[in-house]
Interface confidence: low
């Protein structure tokens, strides 16, 4: 539906508050180094302009596309070339190439200082002085560090943040109230970030068809009572709005997301019996709630899949005449029966089914050829099930920190060329799968584990793409998204790697480590573990455990000492020497 003024249309649909938030996110995700104040100035100018267009849609420039309007704003920044170098070259291009150029310059790992949370008193003071500015800073800081964060969802997290501040700033012990709540919010937001990045990667690398298949599988699991046409409609709409958000079209994305939520709530009867509680909420909470809604109960008496997809005499005819529709119905029917499978596994099964039909339908007796296709799924199903079982057992035995360390060793041996910070981040995140998924009932473990790991490995791939260093990682990252996790799991120790030369300073620590929070202390120790494996990639588990144990004891001893620095400089070299000997 054409509107005379796109910007007026979006302003009216979204309302001023959400409009301003989304424009701020958009600018922060494109120009990640600009200070907050500079972005706010741009946001206010765009908002004032939108208001003039709402008043008169025929006013000058109101008919311009959002890409043109936003791009012109960015390109008008006088310091653009000084701050961003070659990104300024985008401004010489015409739309849509200019917008594509901006997108290419988004940096998944911007060189920004880690965000340090101020103390509770200071936060409450600034929140109470100006809540709008306080929340604006939050949107800006998250968006610039996570340039693909799902914008309407970031508005939801900002709302949650604001509610926490409102609640806790009235408490006597503000810190005790704020800290655990914001820690939990941060965990959720980071998980949301890696999940959205996987969606954007899937769209960028493999296009709409691949993402739509993911959406069909996920929606079919969630809404097994909905018919295929309904699932297709939902998947199509979700694909469109996800593409918009990944493409930086945040106003359209947020508007379409609200529309999709409205549609789902108006058509609950043909979608799911679990939506009502979500549908009673305001727009941001409603969309968030719908995205996390539990799977509906399976319909009773679902017929065997074999009837339509193996035994039917017209399988090859149906496949040949409408491949995507036929494979779509297969994926739908399989997924709705298997909420206990990961989406990645369901897509691998659909791919196997497609490959089998491609081969068999060209043969003299197709049904004899594809007759056992469903049995041939067994190894594909067993592989991730075994992975979940083994890893959850290891997690239960070692606890989260120990499990992370086991993963550090495993992944450093697979890809020792990858930077130490990336390996530590990846292993720590992969290690969180234990407390996130292994605690769930059996039927929910596999989808939780594999789909979570897929998102974390995508982050590894995105960072590795920027500076490729490992052929093994490149091999797994350039293949299909659904094959990534099995590919990484199957990677052997990299035999081509030349061990890193031993440098004593890598393992030299000082008293400042003692004052770090426990999490950061762990990360320092884990970085040392990565370096140990890079130095001795063939070191055995017991050897590494011994060294790590001695290292932990050394830290405990020196951090309790009267003269900490003296202890570090006296015992440190001894530890380094004994570690070298233990690994010889």
């Amino acid at each position: 539906d054409a509107h005379k003024s796109e910007i007026a249309h979006r302003f009216k649909d979204l309302g001023e508050q959400h409009f301003k938030g989304l424009v701020l996110i958009a600018f922060s995700q494109f120009l990640q180094k600009c200070p907050y104040e500079e972005h706010v100035k741009l946001v206010n100018e765009v908002t004032d302009f939108a208001k003039t267009c709402v008043a008169d849609e025929s006013a000058e420039n109101c008919d311009k596309s959002l890409h043109t309007l936003f791009g012109d704003k960015l390109c008008a920044i006088p310091t653009l070339r000084d701050s961003y170098g070659e990104l300024a070259d985008c401004c010489a291009k015409k739309e849509p190439e200019r917008n594509e150029c901006f997108l290419k310059h988004k940096d998944d790992h911007p060189n920004l200082p880690p965000f340090v949370r101020p103390d509770a008193e200071a936060m409450c003071t600034s929140f109470q002085e100006n809540a709008v500015t306080f929340m604006g800073h939050y949107l800006h800081e998250v968006a610039r560090r996570h340039p693909y964060f799902y914008a309407p969802e970031l508005l939801y997290y900002a709302e949650k943040y604001s509610a926490i501040m409102t609640e806790c700033c009235g408490e006597a012990d503000k810190a005790a109230c704020i800290t655990p709540k914001l820690d939990a919010l941060k965990e959720k937001a980071l998980a949301s970030s890696v999940n959205q990045r996987l969606k954007c990667s899937s769209l960028q690398r493999f296009g709409q068809r691949a993402f739509k298949a993911w959406a069909v599988a996920r929606m079919s699991q969630k809404f097994p009572k909905a018919d295929f046409a309904e699932i297709t409609k939902l998947a199509t709409d979700l694909t469109k709005l996800t593409e918009e958000c990944c493409h930086g079209d945040l106003l359209e994305c947020a508007d379409d997301r609200a529309e999709l939520a409205k549609y789902m709530c108006e058509n609950q009867a043909s979608i799911s019996s679990k939506l009502q509680a979500c549908c009673d909420k305001p727009v941001l909470k409603k969309s968030h709630c719908l995205s996390e809604v539990e799977n509906d109960d399976l319909p009773a008496d679902l017929p065997s899949l074999a009837a339509d997809f193996v035994e039917d005499k017209e399988v090859c005819k149906n496949y040949a005449e409408a491949k995507d529709v036929f494979l779509g119905t297969f994926l739908y029917e399989y997924a709705r029966r298997h909420p206990d499978y990961s989406v990645a596994l369901l897509l691998r099964l659909a791919k196997k089914y497609e490959a089998t039909l491609e081969k068999c339908c060209a043969e003299a007796d197709p049904s004899a050829c594809y007759g056992k296709v469903l049995d041939e799924f067994q190894p594909l199903v067993e592989e991730p099930k075994n992975l979940v079982k083994a890893n959850c057992e290891l997690f239960e035995k070692l606890g989260e920190y120990g499990f992370q360390n086991a993963l550090i060793v495993r992944y450093t041996q697979k890809a020792p060329q990858v930077s130490t910070p990336t390996l530590v981040e990846a292993a720590r995140n992969l290690g969180k799968v234990g407390s996130k998924c292994c605690v769930l009932p059996e039927a929910q473990r596999l989808p939780c584990v594999e789909d979570y790991i897929s998102a974390i490995l995508n982050r590894v791939c995105v960072l590795h793409e920027k500076t490729p260093v490992s052929e093994q990682v490149t091999k797994c990252c350039t293949g299909s998204v659904v094959e990534r996790r099995p590919c990484f799991s199957a990677l052997p120790v990299d035999e081509t790697y030349v061990p890193k030369e031993f440098k004593a300073e890598t393992f030299t620590f000082h008293a400042d480590i003692c004052s770090l929070p426990e999490k950061e202390k762990q990360m320092k120790k884990q970085a040392a573990l990565v370096e140990l494996v890079k130095h001795k990639p063939k070191a055995t588990g017991p050897q590494l455990r011994t060294v790590l144990g001695e290292f932990t004891a050394f830290l405990d001893k020196c951090c309790k000492a009267e003269d900490k620095e003296a202890c570090f400089s006296e015992d440190g070299p001894k530890l380094v020497a004994s570690s070298q000997a233990a690994l010889a």
């Epitope: 018919d227 046409a229 309904e230 029917e333």
Partner: nanobody, 114 residues
Framework: QVQLQESGGGLVQPGGSLRLTCTAS????????MSWVRQAPGKGLEWVSA????????RYADSVKGRFTISRDNGKKMLTLDMNSLKPEDTAVYYC???????ASQGTQVTVSS
């Protein structure tokens, strides 16, 4: 090739009845919700009625409620629209469509006139 073939249209007097049928091929009919839509001369497309894949859920536009009945036979891959108490404003080309999709067939002409 997905194919939908409508039939049963014709000229009928106001108050009369018609039965439209749609025969489907080239896709797994029983997995899809289906709809009837219509287009009157010089007007846009208007949704008329929809039915879920298993036939349990039926929906109607306010303008046809109580007069039209949608049904399906998954074994025969057939969709039906029974139209009673027809009015001149029901005059249009009627199309059957998959889900809530756009017409991809010829349709069948229904003319209600005395």
């Amino acid at each position: 090739q997905v194919q939908l073939q409508e039939s049963g249209g014709g000229l009928v007097q106001p108050g009369g009845s018609l039965r439209l049928t749609c025969t489907a091929s080239g896709f797994t009919f029983r997995s899809f919700g289906m709809s009837w839509v219509r287009q009157a001369p010089g007007k846009g497309l208007e949704w008329v009625s929809a039915i879920s894949a298993d036939g349990s859920d039926k929906r109607y536009a306010d303008s046809v409620k109580g007069r039209f009945t949608i049904s399906r036979d998954n074994g025969k891959k057939m969709l039906t629209l029974d139209m009673n108490s027809l009015k001149p404003e029901d005059t249009a080309v009627y199309y059957c469509v998959i889900g809530r999709g756009s017409p991809a067939s010829q349709g069948t002409q229904v003319t209600v006139s005395s």
